[in-house]
């Protein structure tokens, strides 16, 4: 689950960011890959590695310096120091701690000018969290009688998640029991005999299959659930693609 901030490529990648010098084409520094600089705010779990990049060009080849909170960033400013890979215009900090939080500015300069770019680093200390479900999933679906449909529930959980697919059902023509609670049927759940519990596939559907389908996910910390609706159309009607996805926001984190 370890994630590193900045782009994920290794410093052994083949994309060389150096621009060769040409005396007749002198030029102030410029950014060569702004896509790698778009993400300014980096929230990273403690103990992870952070890499900030400022790919630049210029003639003569510019130099790169790093500032922390507007001041020169020295090796002794953090335990374990940091690495600068000049050929990749990168700053690498391993095993970040809360004191590493702050603004990191790359200052790229040559005799014709200078440019700078600032990243903000937030070091997040980890706490156990309940499952997080991807917004918009499962998505509403429609199909004709006899058709097939698939609902997908994307789950993120550090701890082992238990996934259940639940549908509201009727008993003796009633949706609710004497206690006022709805009648629910577990259609599928994660376990030994269940393959890919994040997907609920329905085949050869009938009108009876129409209704609300709930993806309920629990771990030892708590629960989350989201639902989607299945519309079953008569055979002669073509399915209408749902434009709006309705997701219960109750458990979104």
């Amino acid at each position: 689950d370890a994630i590193s901030s900045g782009d994920d490529e290794d410093d052994t990648d083949s994309s060389e960011d150096f621009v060769s010098e040409n005396r007749s084409n002198q030029r102030a520094p410029y950014w060569t890959n702004t896509e790698k600089m778009e993400k300014r705010l980096h929230a990273v779990p403690a103990a992870n590695t952070v890499k900030f990049r400022c790919p630049a060009g210029g003639n003569p080849t510019p130099t790169m310096r790093w500032l922390k909170n507007g001041k020169e960033f020295k090796q002794e400013h953090r335990i374990g120091g940091y690495k600068v890979r000049n050929q990749h215009w990168s700053l690498i900090m391993e095993s970040v701690v809360p004191s590493d939080k702050g603004n990191y500015t790359c200052l790229v300069e040559n005799e014709y000018g200078s440019i700078n770019h600032t990243y903000h680093l937030d070091v997040v200390e980890r706490s156990p969290h309940r499952p997080i479900l991807q917004a918009g999933l499962p998505a509403n679906a429609s199909t004709v009688v006899g058709g097939d449909v698939e609902f997908v529930c994307k789950v993120y959980s550090d701890a082992q998640p238990h996934i259940q697919w639940i549908k509201h059902v009727e008993k003796n023509g009633s949706k609710y029991g004497p206690d006022g609670l709805p009648y629910l049927k577990v259609l599928k759940h994660s376990g030994i005999n269940s393959s890919n519990a994040e997907v609920l596939a329905l085949f050869n559907v009938t009108e009876m299959d129409a209704g609300e389908y709930i993806c309920k996910v629990s771990n030892y910390i708590g629960q989350a659930n989201q639902s989607a609706w299945l519309t079953v159309l008569p055979k002669q009607q073509a399915p209408v693609r749902e434009k709006e996805i309705t997701a219960s926001p109750d458990y979104l984190e």
């Epitope: 706490s127 156990p128 309940r130 082992q160 910390i221 629960q223």
Partner: antibody, heavy 114, light 107 residues
């Protein structure tokens, strides 16, 4: 800040019941499981069960199934653990703990003695 | 139920020592293991969860590793305040079982 405050010590007779409360504050009570764990004198930790207050879903250690009942009152952000048919072996400190076992109550000593 | 077998049950070490406690699960629990510290008369404190994630505010001398059935908890440099009993716990499936504990003493 997150706090779990448990009810006071109890002395009970064998065969009777005890109900321990755990009042939560400083976080959204309904968003996390509430676990109950006990520790007999000089012994290790034993998980009793848990409740998800939002919908009342419970999970129990089979060892306590039928004797332990865990409930939650959303209006007061309080969880309860009731243990019936008490015997001397139930003498222990009973703890409530938030979902990730990251916050614990101070413990409630239950003594079962004739 | 998943059994958690912790060893040793007690150990004596000097300040500054590296201390290692192990826990073995009776079945694969992936990385769903937590470690707690408990001092006499106090509630347990969460140190490590999901096998290797150090909980907020826990000193960096405490670390955890392992997956599957074998797990290790390490104190890199023992401090006087680390004298306590340490427990492992699996949070893979209910019931969430604990190891029997390791009592750590200063030599």
């Amino acid at each position: 800040q997150v706090q779990l405050v448990q009810s006071g010590a109890e002395v009970k007779k064998p065969g009777s019941s005890v109900k321990v409360s755990c009042k939560a504050s400083g976080y959204t009570f309904t968003s996390y499981n509430m676990h109950w764990v006990r520790q007999a004198p000089g012994q290790g930790l034993e998980w009793i069960g848990a409740i998800f207050p939002e919908n009342g879903d419970t999970s129990y250690n089979q060892k306590f199934k039928g004797r332990a009942t865990i409930t939650a009152d959303k209006s007061t952000s309080t969880a309860y653990m009731e243990l019936s048919s008490l015997r001397s072996e139930d003498t222990a400190v009973y703890y409530c703990a938030r979902g990730g076992f990251d916050y614990w109550g101070q413990g409630t000593t239950v003594t079962v003695s004739s | 139920d998943i059994q958690m077998t912790q060893s040793p049950s007690s150990l004596s070490a000097s300040v500054g020592d590296r201390v290692t406690i192990t826990c073995k699960a009776s079945q694969d629990v992936s990385t769903n293991v937590a470690w707690y510290q408990q001092k006499p008369g106090k509630a347990p404190k969460l140190l490590i969860f999901s096998a290797s994630y150090r909980y907020t505010g826990v000193p960096s001398r405490f670390s955890g590793s392992g997956s599957g059935t074998d797990f290790t908890f390490t104190i890199s440099s023992l401090q006087p305040e680390d004298i306590a009993t340490y427990y492992c716990q699996q949070h893979y499936s209910s019931p969430y079982t604990f190891g029997q504990g390791t009592k750590l003493e200063i030599k």
